[in-house]
């Protein structure tokens, strides 16, 4: 229901807002940390900016019905069309309790539209408990608050991010369903803008209360690698990022925003076919530890540190990084044991404003995406969109550590 700058992207025939009707695997484990790159010469299943290019292994008889991969934060299992479990992962929304199912009329009738939804449970995404998400018509979900428009480009769950226009057909709907333990979004019979003759797509994303994420594909009428990304990115996977503020050298009284995409999983688009499914199972993260002892003794793929002031366990790579820096947590944790903290009062904390945001591990991470912009009072309220796809090309997995100055 909102402006869609970049004219031409939202054009659909007639009145696009006409009302709609109702409606096993095996393991390949690798301990990884940011900067580590596993063997790049195998067939690529997915790209993981936290751990470099990951390998796709085949079953002994060379069939790839089920593929499992480890991405530091998640283990993904890909189920091919012939795998019975792929059908089991499809949630039949029509069979669900009618009171728990909602056809979203705004999303079902518009293009490049989003709508915020509050979940009935805390969904752990990269270890962060989320209650509010934003469903987009383009086959994906924005995860997290809109602090900065660029942050939304790097915090997503995307079963199939593409230029879908539900306003094209009265049969197209965006439906969601929440039963208290799982939240399912289904893009039902949606068409690609400009590619309507290829047929309709039906797929869904399920967010489980235990943090599992399932992508299930019912109808994929064309080869996903053939979908044009000139008007809209085409992606399948997950991404998370954090934003940090640091003083701008040019304007002393302002602070520069840097958005750091600390982890991304991109699935091979050729694996997205009708009746296939992908299941992401979350791996333990530092954030789940609630005490210093548990934090320091954890045997995770991450280097967990305890910040006594914040009473938080972290690798330093999560959405709370700004606080981690402001309170000098990286320095505090250096060479200290839990016993060292026992006599300290953690209630009198105040941010260390002189603390440099670019400490240690952040600068050594090679797989990163920085998007810088000058702070404005509330630039999510402004119209920053400059037509076309804006800075889409800067979001390529090949982009590593290059600041993009937005000048906002």
């Amino acid at each position: 229901l909102s402006p869609q700058p970049g004219a031409g992207h939202d054009e659909g025939p007639g009145s696009g807002w006409a009302a709609k009707g109702t409606v096993r695997g095996w393991n390949r484990r690798a301990r990884e940390s940011p900067g580590h790159v596993s063997e790049p010469d195998r067939t690529q299943l997915s790209q993981d900016l936290g751990g470099g290019t990951l390998a796709m292994d085949t079953l002994p008889d060379n069939r790839t019905r089920v593929v499992e991969d480890n991405h530091s934060y998640y283990v993904s299992r890909l189920y091919g069309p012939s795998e019975p479990h792929s059908r089991e992962l499809w949630v039949d929304v029509a069979e669900a309790n009618r009171s728990q199912v909602k056809i979203h009329t705004i999303l079902s009738n518009t293009h490049r539209q989003a709508s915020r939804v509050v979940l009935s449970f805390d969904f752990p995404f990269y270890g962060h408990p989320l209650r509010q998400i934003t469903i987009a018509t383009g086959g994906f979900i924005f995860m997290g608050d809109v602090i900065h428009r660029m942050l939304t480009a790097t915090q997503y769950v995307a079963p199939l991010m593409a230029n879908f226009n539900p306003g094209y057909s009265d049969n197209s709907t965006v439906v969601y369903f929440d039963n208290g333990t799982v939240f399912v979004v289904q893009w039902d019979h949606v068409y690609l803008q400009g590619w309507e003759d290829k047929g309709s797509f039906t797929f869904q994303a399920a967010l489980h209360h235990d943090g599992r994420i399932v992508f299930a594909y019912k109808e994929i009428p064309m080869s996903v690698p053939e979908i044009s990304s000139s008007q809209h990115p085409v992606k399948t996977g997950l991404s998370d990022a954090f934003m940090i503020l640091n003083p701008s050298p040019d304007v002393p009284e302002s602070r520069r925003r840097s958005i750091f995409e600390y982890h991304r999983i991109e699935l091979d688009p050729s694996k997205v076919t009708s009746m296939s499914a992908v299941e992401f199972t979350p791996l333990p993260t530092c954030l789940q530890h609630r005490s210093c002892d548990a934090c320091m003794s954890s045997d995770l793929t991450f280097n967990c540190s305890w910040c006594h002031v914040l009473q938080r366990c972290s690798s330093g790579f999560d959405r709370y990084r700004q606080e981690w820096m402001d309170y000098g947590c990286a320095q505090e944790a250096e060479g200290r044991m839990c016993e060292d903290f026992q006599d300290e009062d953690h209630d009198s904390a105040s941010p260390d404003t002189s603390f440099s945001p670019y400490d240690g591990d952040l600068t050594t991470t090679s797989s990163s995406l920085f998007i810088d912009s000058l702070t404005t009072e509330d630039d999510t309220k402004l119209n920053p969109y400059a037509g076309g796809d804006g800075l889409q090309n800067n979001l390529s997995p090949k982009t590593k550590g290059t600041p993009v100055h937005l000048g906002t």
Partner: antibody
Framework: QVQLVESGGGVVQPGRSLRLSCAAS????????MHWVRQAPGKGLEWVAV????????YYADSVKGRFTISRDNSKNTLYLQMNSLRAEDTAVYYC????????????????????WGQGTLVTVSS | EIVMTQSPATLSVSPGERATLSCRAS??????LAWYQQKPGQAPRLLIY???TRATGIPARFSGSGSGTEFTLTISSLQSEDFAVYYC?????????FGQGTKVEIK
């Protein structure tokens, strides 16, 4: 400054037509979805219609569907409401309102209320 | 369509007192809710969006709360200029719908 000014109201007989205009200034009109909202004398607010920024998508309240048409001319920064087959119950002050949008990446956005309103124009349908 | 119901229809309050207005949705609208103020002969003015965020230039005495189906607009200390009619509106789904309004009058 940001401003919306409606015009075209007046007294009209039932079954006749009327066209309302809303002139926008102080902002990039073509970047915003626009709405019409009406208020019958002594009554509450009723949403009437919306049009997307480019004019390609339109949606109407059931009470006016098939009789009213929302349109816009971005080159003239003007919003229109063509009202046909008018009825006595269409008597109201008609406001145009700008959609307050929150921008996300890739041109996505979600709606968050009407942040700019015109002063209204009175339409009286009476024989 | 989603029906929005406001209560009370009229609220009589003395200047300086606290006013609490309620809005109920017939189904969940999450936090996709706005509050407007309208004075006689004037157009409505956006006060709150996202159920709890004050619009630009709105004084801190206005606050919104709630999520799902139950929402509240609170005016902590009524000023003379606050006596008006207040409307809630959901923008979670089409058609967009308003409550019938609550008139806040001087006691």
């Amino acid at each position: 400054q940001v401003q919306l000014v409606e015009s075209g109201g007046g007294v009209v007989q039932p079954g006749r037509s009327l066209r309302l205009s809303c002139a926008a200034s102080g902002f990039i009109f073509s970047d915003y979805d626009m709405h019409w909202v009406r208020q019958a004398p002594g009554k509450g607010l009723e949403w009437v219609a919306v049009i997307s920024h480019s004019g390609s998508n339109k949606y109407y309240a059931d009470s006016v569907k098939g009789r009213f048409t929302i349109s816009r001319d971005n080159s003239k920064n003007t919003l229109y409401l063509q009202m046909n087959s008018l009825r006595a119950e269409d008597t109201a002050v008609y406001y145009c309102a700008r959609d307050r949008s929150v921008y996300l990446y890739y041109g996505y956005h979600y709606y968050e209320g009407f942040d700019v309103w015109g002063q209204g124009t009175l339409v009286t349908v009476s024989s | 369509e989603i029906v929005m119901t406001q209560s009370p229809a009229t609220l009589s309050v003395s200047p300086g007192e606290r006013a609490t207005l309620s809005c109920r949705a017939s189904q969940s609208v999450y936090n996709n809710l706005a509050w407007y103020q309208q004075k006689p002969g004037q157009a409505p003015r956006l006060l709150i969006y996202g159920a709890s965020t004050r619009a630009t230039g709105i004084p801190a005495r206005f606050s919104g709360s709630g999520s799902g189906t139950e929402f509240t607009l609170t005016i902590s200390s009524l000023q003379s200029e606050d006596f008006a009619v207040y409307y809630c509106q959901q923008y979670n789904d089409l058609p967009l719908t308003f409550g019938q309004g609550t008139k806040v009058e001087i006691k």
